[in-house]
């Protein structure tokens, strides 16, 4: 048993995005710090075998298998995978420790498996299993949190259905507006289920887990704040628990709330309240009502009523399915080359949305926010100015939502020309779409300025490139214009742009000629 | 390296619920399937098995102390946080969290790395 | 719940000595059986795992044998540093519970 080396089995996350199949590797790429996976020695296995815990990797992430030998001498190795064997180059680091590796580039469910590490030293021979399994995120989920009121208690459990299960967090916030975002230092956050300060101005409670985070925040009416100049509404699916919260500060303890629906005082057992003193020995009121499941007769508008302040209502709407309502007619754009410029979609969603910005088949992260009249609004103002076509893409379990934009940046046209035997060929892709002309130089028109009128064909928008619209225009050559030097231009309302042919030549003469008009 | 450190209060009272939390480095619960326990061992007395969760997110927890034990873990902060409610100074001892690597072969060599243990005393 | 009883609680031996702990366990446990060693303050350490495999980096003079209910920890040569407590561990089925400890003592 002494005899045995001391394996140290590690796991190496890379930040890169290289495209390829498990390869044996010494080299080091853009890595995280390596991860230990418990290497033991296997019992009751015959021959010496190490295992490693069992590895779990996102699909298309690149990782590396690596062991660490301290044992005297030098070693041979092999690896082996699903039966084939794939080079092994052992190497020795700076505190002479043999060190395999095993990069796996871009994971797919063809590189998972086990991976044995067959190693030969001076003294024994044994073998290292790894286990790589893809994780398997199709049985995630993540769902908004609800409220639920704590038993015997004034306390609000807050509640997240999710797999693997969430860690559950308040986020509280005692500012107004703006100060009350994410990472403000305003902003309390609480990692616990149960929450028993319910005054705060601003009260959400959020569930993280591998799939991302999801929040919900307590719906509140303070009878100290003007009113909204829109009713404020709220949206609940049939089942869903209704809470909501109306808060109120006075002078002194002489003052009450009450909850109303349509005009009728809510049942007994369908509300409770909370009373605190405040630092400044105002007393502070807060009334919540709620329905633990809601059903279509629970619609209408809720008012909460003071004896020493105006009352508020707020429009609750019980609908059967969730949605999303904005217009899904494309829109275009044309904008400067330094204008500034987003796009913008204006909704209104329920549940909250998940949406996401492509251009060029690459997505972009999506914000949104929600405005005073109960729309939210999710802009993109990362385009860089690259014309062509952006889309918008909503959804939120229930309903999906796309709406197309294109962007046209306007600016002078650039011609790009080839020749071929039979034929000259020249594109540009300017906005406004230009227009084409060809003209012939020769002695007389040394300037090229004699328009050649026939055996031009032009090809408006033939390519769309993600939405970006190309020009072009060719010009079959006659035999007399063999051996011709011919000009294309291409204009719009920002200028001109030529290029000069020299006929039945593979290729554009070796000058532009760019005139700007 | 890999280590496993404990945090939490060092002095809690009769009655009120105790938060522990196991902080661990040089490995992950994303990548590599690991479990975690809780073990602890009042002054001059044996060890005591406290629960368990899987990298699946199974929990076990012991038999006696079930109704009053809640684990969890939060993979992005690399913790395992142990609650235990309604304490008693019976409940003074250091506690331990101990790492449980998982194998396909579906052997186990139970726990290979613990931490340094945090004490808690039980007093009013 | 598995009950696994330790025996002896406490011995006293020389350095050079050959030392036997034993863990009885109340049902079948297969190999689910583990060994740690613990000294005064610090954090228990494994020695052995299903219930004969010795874990890397500990000196061979430790063992393990056994299957099923008895299981046995021996020390070939006692040491100066292997004075310390010594705990089993079933792991078989829960709750995993551990022997009430052996402490080994200069005599």
């Known amino acids: 048993n002494q005899d045995l080396p001391v394996i140290k089995c590690v796991l190496i996350n890379h930040k890169n995005n290289d495209s390829s199949v498990g390869k044996s590797s010494s080299y080091p790429m853009v890595s995280e710090s390596p991860e230990d996976l418990g290497c033991a020695l296997r019992p009751q296995s015959a021959g010496t075998v190490y295992e490693a815990a069992t590895v779990e990797v996102d699909v298309s992430a690149s990782i590396t298998l690596q062991v660490l030998v301290d044992t005297p001498g030098n070693i041979s190795c092999l690896w082996v995978f699903k039966h084939s064997s794939l080079n092994c180059q052992p190497h020795f680091d700076v505190q002479n420790r043999g060190v395999v590796s095993m990069v796996i580039l871009k994971m797919t469910e063809t590189q998972a498996g086990e991976y044995l590490l067959f190693i030969q030293s001076e003294a024994t021979n044994y073998t290292i299993l790894f286990t790589v399994s893809i994780r398997n995120t199709l049985l995630f989920t993540l769902r908004r949190p609800y409220f639920r009121k704590m038993e015997n208690q004034d306390a609000l459990v807050c509640i997240s259905e999710s797999v693997p299960e969430p860690i559950v967090e308040w986020v509280l916030c005692d500012s107004q507006g703006e100060s009350c975002k994410e990472e403000s230092p305003a902003v309390v956050k609480k990692e616990e289920k149960v929450l028993h300060e319910l005054f705060g101005t601003d009260i959400r409670c959020c569930a993280r887990n591998e799939l991302g985070r999801e929040c919900t925040r307590l719906f509140t009416i303070d009878l100290n704040q003007t009113p909204q100049t829109t009713l404020p509404q709220l949206f609940l699916k049939v089942g869903e628990p209704l809470w909501i919260r109306c808060k109120a500060v006075h002078v002194n303890h002489g003052f009450g709330l009450t909850w109303e629906l349509e005009n009728k005082a809510l049942e007994e057992g369908s509300y409770f309240e909370m009373s605190t003193y405040s630092t400044n020995r105002t007393m502070i009121r807060i009334l919540f009502a709620f329905v633990s499941s809601v059903a279509r007769n629970d619609t209408g508008y809720y008012t909460c009523s003071s004896s020493k302040h105006p009352s508020q209502s707020a429009l609750v709407t019980i609908v059967e399915k969730g949605f999303i309502n904005a217009t899904n007619s494309s829109e275009d754009y044309e904008i400067d080359q330094y204008e500034e410029f987003c796009f913008s979609v204006r909704f209104k969603a329920y549940p909250q949305i998940r949406c996401t910005w492509t251009f060029s088949r690459k997505s972009f992260p999506c914000e949104q926010k929600g405005l005073d009249d109960g729309y939210s609004v999710s802009k993109f103002c990362n385009h860089k100015h690259q014309p062509g076509e952006y889309i918008f893409h909503a959804e939120n379990g229930d309903a999906q939502f796309t709406k197309m934009f294109t962007l046209n940046i306007r600016r002078k046209p650039q011609v790009l020309a080839e020749a071929s035997a039979s034929q000259a060929s020249c594109s540009s892709d300017g906005y406004p779409l230009p227009s084409w002309t060809w003209k012939k130089c020769s002695d007389k028109s040394p300037n090229c300025t004699e328009d050649i009128p026939e055996g031009v064909w032009n090809r408006k928008a033939n390519r769309k490139v993600f939405g970006q619209w190309v020009s072009s225009s060719t010009l079959n050559m006659s035999e007399a214009m063999k051996g011709f030097l011919v000009k294309c231009c291409a204009y719009n309302s920002l200028g001109t742009s030529c290029e000069t042919i020299l006929l039945n030549s593979p290729g554009p003469f070796p000058f532009i000629q760019d005139s700007i008009s | 390296q890999v280590t496993l450190k404990e945090s939490g209060p060092a002095l809690v009272k009769p009655t009120e619920t105790l938060t522990l939390t196991c902080t661990v480095s040089?490995?992950?619960?994303?990548?590599?399937?690991?479990?975690v326990s809780w073990i602890r061992q009042p002054p001059g007395k044996a060890l005591e098995w406290l629960a368990h969760?899987?990298?699946?997110?199974?929990?076990s927890y012991s038999t006696s102390l079930k109704s009053r034990l809640t684990i969890s873990k939060d993979t992005s902060k690399s913790q395992v946080v142990l609650t235990l409610t309604n304490m008693d100074p019976v409940d003074t001892a250091t506690y331990f969290c101990?790492?449980?690597?998982?194998?396909?072969?579906?052997?186990?060599?139970?726990?290979?790395?613990w931490g340094q243990g945090t004490m808690v005393t039980v007093s009013s | 719940d598995i009950q696994m009883t330790q025996s002896p609680s406490s011995l006293s031996a020389s350095v050079g000595d050959r030392v036997t702990i034993t863990c009885r366990a109340s049902q079948d446990i297969g190999y689910d059986l583990g060994w740690y060693q613990q000294k005064p303050g610090k954090a228990p350490k494994r020695l052995i795992y299903?219930?004969?495999t010795l874990q890397s980096g500990v000196p061979s003079r430790f063992s393990g044998s056994g299957s099923g209910t008895e299981f046995t920890l021996i020390i070939s040569s006692l040491q100066p540093e292997d004075f310390a407590t010594y705990y089993c561990?079933?792991?078989?089925?829960?709750?995993?519970?551990f022997g009430q400890g052996t402490k080994v003592e200069i005599k």
């Open positions: 969760i899987f990298s699946n997110d199974e929990k």
């Open positions: 101990a790492r449980m690597p998982e194998y396909s072969s579906g052997w186990s060599g139970a726990f290979d790395i």
């Open positions: 561990l079933q792991h078989n089925s829960f709750p995993w519970t």
């Open positions: 299903a219930a004969s």
């Open positions: 040089g490995f992950s619960f994303r990548n590599a399937r690991m479990g």
